[in-house]
Interface confidence: low
């Protein structure tokens, strides 16, 4: 239904707290360099204006679209051109072009310092002094570093943060209470960020149809007892919610997500038997819980998939009459039978099925042609299954850090032109798949591994798009989203690459490395490892292990030495010589 004032409608639906949080996220995601105070001022102005519209929907400007209202606010910021360069040109455009322009200027890798967590005592003091400002800072800092973070989900993580601080700041040992809990939230939020970015990439590059196919597969796996009409309705609604969030329409997105959660909870009987615990929770927790609810038990009496999609005499007729609906039912039926497959794999199978029908239905004897289609799925299914087995075996043998190093070597060989920081970040993220997925039961490993890898590789593609340097990466990133991971997996050593010269300073370290936190130490060592591979792309695993063991021994020795600086300056050059010799 149409509302006289969109801003009043959203304020009323969402309530002041969520309204303000979402407006802050929106501004922080658009203008990523502005300080918290600058954004907080704008948020307060927008909120005050929304309240006047709630009081009188006919008041001046209350009938304007949210894009117009928000865009005007952003464009009124002083020194916009000095701070944001060509983004200021967006302000010369009219809506909807102005908003599109803002979206195009979102930076996936902003040059902002890492978000450092203050020490416990300081954090608790500022939280107690002003919880609202403290949480506002959290939303601002995360949103500006992750400009596509799913806004209603970020409100959920802020709520988690708030609950942890409330609990831990009351304890004697605040540090040991806060650290593991906040680490857990951070890890989950980072995964949420890359997953959502993947959804927005799908929407931006391939449109709503591609996203809806993803949603049909995912929802069919989770709700195998829901019928096709129900799954289609849920997929359509979920597509709308994600389109709005990816498009910067955060108030509409959060409002529609709340509506979808309400619908699911009111229609549990036709959706799933597993929703009740989620539906008992308050809004943010409920929507989060529904988004990762466990799969419902599969119906026991499902007929073989071949009946309707291979053996039926009407296959080509049904396909020709309504291609999208027929392919949608195939995806639904296949996905509900295979919660053990990744969504990416299910979409590849649906694509293969579609290509087979396109080819076969034009031939003289279609059934003879498409009769073997299910058998032809086999290699497509085996490939990711082998990937999971090989990588989980390697992870179990090496542990997370060793597994990350193995991936780093592999990916540096595949794309040595890519910057070392990007390779290290990618390998560290890809390596976490072991901890995240390899400890799961067998039937949950494949979906966990492949869909997580796809999301991480999407980030690799986004960063590479900014400065394309590797033909290998460009090739894999140019294809369809679901083919990316197999494409990257199939890459081998880049034979066109001219090895980097050996520079001693790249492998020169100082005593300050000794005081770094373990994570930073690992990154330093991994940076050196990537540089070694760039110098010798065909170095054997044994050679690299020898050098890295030597390097680890050197750090251990010098960091334990009484005179660390002397140790580093005398032993360092010897290490460099030994490295060169080992790789010769």
């Amino acid at each position: 239904e149409a509302h006289k004032s969109e801003i009043a409608h959203r304020y009323n639906d969402l309530g002041e707290q969520h309204f303000k949080g979402l407006v802050l996220i929106a501004f922080s995601q658009y203008l990523q360099k502005c300080s918290y105070d600058e954004h907080a001022k704008l948020v307060q102005e927008v909120t005050d204006f929304a309240k006047t519209c709630v009081a009188d929907e006919s008041a001046a400007n209350c009938d304007k679209s949210l894009h117009t209202l928000f865009g005007d606010k952003l464009c009124a910021i002083p020194n916009l051109r000095e701070n944001y360069g060509e983004l200021a040109d967006c302000c010369t455009k009219q809506e909807p072009e102005r908003n599109e322009c803002f979206l195009q200027h979102k930076d996936d890798n902003p040059s902002l310092p890492p978000f450092e967590r203050p020490e416990a005592e300081a954090m608790c003091t500022s939280f107690k002094e002003n919880p609202t400002t403290f949480m506002g800072h959290y939303l601002h800092e995360v949103a500006r570093r992750h400009p596509y973070f799913y806004a209603p989900e970020l409100l959920y993580y802020a709520e988690q943060y708030n609950e942890i601080l409330t609990q831990c700041c009351a304890e004697a040992d605040k540090e040991s209470c806060l650290t593991p809990k906040l680490d857990g939230v951070k890890e989950k939020a980072l995964v949420s960020s890359v997953r959502q970015r993947m959804k927005c990439s799908s929407m931006q590059k391939f449109g709503e149809r591609a996203f809806k196919a993803w949603a049909v597969a995912r929802l069919s796996q989770t709700f195998p007892n829901a019928d096709f009409a129900e799954i289609t309705k849920l997929a359509t609604d979920l597509t709308k919610v994600n389109k709005e969030c990816c498009h910067g329409d955060l108030l509409e997105c959060a409002d529609d997500r709340a509506e979808l959660a309400k619908y699911m909870c009111e229609n549990q009987a036709t959706i799933s038997s597993k929703l009740q615990t989620c539906c008992d929770k308050p809004l943010l927790k409920k929507a989060h819980c529904l988004s990762e609810v466990e799969h419902d038990t599969m119906p026991a009496d499902l007929p073989a998939i071949a009946a309707d999609f291979v053996e039926d005499q009407e296959v080509c007729k049904n396909y020709a009459e309504a291609k999208d609906v027929f392919l949608g039912t195939f995806l639904y039926e296949y996905s509900r039978r295979h919660p053990d497959y990744s969504v990416s794999l299910l979409l590849r199978l649906a694509k293969k099925y579609e290509a087979t029908l396109e080819k076969c239905c034009a031939e003289a004897n279609p059934p003879a042609c498409y009769g073997t289609v299910l058998a032809e799925f086999q290699p497509l299914v085996e490939e990711p299954k082998n990937l999971v087995k090989t990588n989980c075996d390697l992870y179990e043998k090496l542990g997370e850090y060793g597994f990350q190093n193995a991936i780093l070597v592999r990916y540096t060989q595949k794309a040595p032109q890519v910057s070392t920081p990007t390779l290290v970040e990618a390998a560290r993220n890809l390596g976490r798949v072991g901890t995240k997925c390899c400890t799961l039961p067998e039937d949950q490993r494949l979906p966990c591994v492949e869909d997580y890898l796809s999301a991480i590789l999407n980030r690799v593609c986004l960063l590479h798009e900014k400065t394309p340097v590797s033909e290998h990466v460009t090739k894999c990133c140019s294809g369809s989203l679901v083919e990316r991971r197999p494409c990257f997996s199939a890459l081998t050593v880049d034979e066109t690459y001219v090895p980097k010269e050996f520079k001693a300073e790249t492998f020169t370290f100082h005593s300050d490395i000794c005081t770094l936190p373990e994570k930073e130490k690992q990154i330093k060592k991994q940076t050196a490892l990537a540089e070694l591979v760039k110098h010798k792309p065909k170095a054997t695993a044994e050679q690299l292990k020898t050098v890295m063991d030597d390097f680890a021994q050197f750090l251990d020795t010098c960091c334990k030495a009484a005179d660390k600086d002397t140790c580093f300056s005398t032993e360092g050059p010897n290490l460099v010589t030994r490295c060169k010799d080992a790789l010769a």
């Epitope: 593991p180 680490d183 857990g184 890890e187 989950k188 989980c392 992870y395 179990e396 542990g399 997370e400 850090y401 060793g402 072991g434 901890t435 995240k436 390899c438 400890t439 799961l440 039961p441 067998e442 490993r445």
Partner: nanobody
Framework: EVQLVESGGGLVQPGGSLRLSCAAS????????MSWVRQAPGKGPEWVSA????????RYAESVKGRFTISRDNAKKTLYLQMNSLKPEDTAVYYC????????GSQGTQVTVSS
């Protein structure tokens, strides 16, 4: 050599509690996700619970959710399983595993729930 030694099993009445421990050695315990698996007489191994290397992410089989709690102490290289509200169907040999592998050759610890 990788070694996993479970302890803490025993005979307990329905509704009772037990805390299982698994002492690990011979590998970098803090780098690995760990699981508890159980095997009832005449049945195949059943996955019970898993925890990631840092202890932040935990997962449970439907049959034990809300009753069992998995945890770990990386400094002590020990994995734990707190089992409350035990039922006769929890009777099994329980053993800890690295990742999802069930072929680590540990002895396991017998848990019997009976009145």
């Amino acid at each position: 050599e990788v070694q996993l030694v479970e302890s803490g099993g025993g005979l307990v009445q329905p509704g009772g509690s037990l805390r299982l421990s698994c002492a690990a050695s011979g590998f970098t315990f803090g780098s690995f996700g760990m699981s508890w698996v159980r095997q009832a007489p005449g049945k195949g191994p059943e996955w019970v619970s898993a925890i990631d290397s840092g202890g932040a992410d935990t997962r449970y089989a439907e049959s034990v959710k809300g009753r069992f709690t998995i945890s770990r102490d990386n400094a002590k290289k020990t994995l734990y399983l707190q089992m409350n509200s035990l039922k006769p169907e929890d009777t099994a040999v329980y053993y800890c595993t690295i990742g999802q592998s069930t072929s680590r050759g540990s002895q396991g610890t017998q848990v019997t729930v009976s009145s």
